[in-house]
């Protein structure tokens, strides 16, 4: 069964800067990745970035840089200042649309005990929804 993992890390140098990494563990090719915060995309969450293998990448503040790390994983740097800045308990969600398998989504947040700049290794997060 395909799985999605989400890793959230706060940068040690900038405490309002977060790095979100997400990956898809499945055999299909990725057709779209959507990163949101505040909950799953379409369920109250706000879209931060959308990545498409051919058409490119779209990102919205406070997203600073979204990119493909591999064919099945992405990273997103958020830089916050003011009302739109993320906080330590913010939930980030990644939805992978895989062709032809369907859509898989998982969410994660900063581990409560983590020091800035440190985080647990990426492990599959609970799958919230499979379309």
């Amino acid at each position: 069964t395909p799985e999605v993992w989400v890793q959230v890390r706060m940068e040690a140098t900038e405490l309002s800067s977060f790095t979100i990494r997400c990956g898809f563990l499945g055999s299909g090719s990725i057709s779209l990745v959507t990163v949101s915060w505040g909950g799953p995309n379409g369920a109250g969450g706000t879209t931060l970035a959308v990545l498409h293998p051919e058409r490119g990448i779209r990102q919205w503040a406070p997203a600073r840089q979204a990119r493909w790390e591999t064919q099945s994983s992405i990273s997103l740097i958020l830089e916050g200042s003011g009302a739109s800045s993320p906080c330590a308990n913010t939930t980030f969600c990644c939805k992978f649309a895989s062709f032809p398998e369907g859509s898989w989504e998982a969410c994660g947040s900063l581990p409560p005990s983590s020091d800035p700049g440190l985080s647990a290794p990426p492990t599959p997060a609970p799958i919230l929804r499979a379309d």
């Epitope: 090719s29 057709s31 779209l32 959308v50 498409h52 051919e54 058409r55 490119g56 779209r58 990102q59 919205w60 062709f99």
Partner: antibody, heavy 118, light 107 residues
Framework: EVQLVESGGGLVQPGGSLRLSCAAS????????MHWVRQATGKGLEWVAG???????YYPGSVKGRFTISRENAKNSLYLQMNSLRAGDTAIYYC????????????WGQGTTVTVSS | DIQMTQSPSSLSASVGDRVTITCRAS??????LGWYQQKPGKAPKRLIY???SLQSGVSSRFSGSGSGTEFTLTISSLQPEDFATYYC?????????FGGGTKVEIK
């Protein structure tokens, strides 16, 4: 209500220039990709330009180097500067929003007519 | 560039008929395809996006299917207001390209 209103069309001679405008309202204009699509009388739809929320621009080969798409987010406005116009550019020009990127245009204006003729 | 071949270019049908329009992409586009309806003198209106998702406010008699290179728009029971021209659009890669259109006329 989401609305797009084009203006600036008219009659122009071959080799001339024209600038089309599109006024957007009812949505957060700065977030969305925007496009121009044209349709010659009795013909099909042809995509002629696109611009993303970061200002990067995209064109088909048929207009590259002649047409320039731009946006002014503070004025909720989209533009199409058309230079070196040809008779084949005669068409209705539609402004369109791609509100759910990358799923194509979801909202269209009513169009403005461009006629290139001597 | 990706070519979109739409068929038929025109068809005649009666109210209540089931109508099927096909779009074929020159290369795989996954499910990055939309369907549009256009009536004379009007702007196009999106019916379907992402190959099979129904646009909000559009009647459920319209449905889309397919992936990869073969796509279909189906009108389950043609209504008088459905007589129009239909276009497919691939949004998989630039340049964005439309099919040539299918004119649905009254038989």
């Amino acid at each position: 209500e989401v609305q797009l209103v084009e203006s600036g069309g008219g009659l122009v001679q071959p080799g001339g220039s024209l600038r089309l405008s599109c006024a957007a309202s009812g949505f957060t204009f700065s977030r969305d990709d925007m496009h121009w699509v044209r349709q010659a009388t009795g013909k099909g739809l042809e995509w002629v330009a696109g611009i993303d929320n970061a200002g990067d621009t995209y064109y088909p080969g048929s207009v590259k180097g002649r047409f320039t798409i731009s946006r002014e987010n503070a004025k909720n406005s989209l533009y199409l500067q058309m230079n070196s116009l040809r008779a084949g550019d005669t068409a209705i020009y539609y402004c369109a929003r791609e509100g759910q990127w990358p799923y194509g245009m979801d909202v269209w204006g009513q169009g403005t007519t461009v006629t290139v003729s001597s | 560039d990706i070519q979109m071949t739409q068929s038929p270019s025109s068809l005649s049908a009666s109210v209540g008929d089931r109508v099927t329009i096909t779009c074929r992409a020159s290369q795989g586009i996954r499910n990055d395809l939309g369907w549009y309806q256009q009536k004379p003198g009007k702007a196009p209106k999106r019916l379907i996006y992402s190959a099979s998702s129904l646009q909000s406010g559009v009647s459920s008699r319209f449905s889309g299917s397919g992936s990869g290179t073969e796509f279909t728009l189906t009108i389950s029971s043609l209504q008088p207001e459905d007589f129009a021209t239909y276009y497919c659009l691939q949004s998989n890669s630039y340049p964005l390209t439309f099919g040539g259109g299918t004119k649905v006329e009254i038989k």
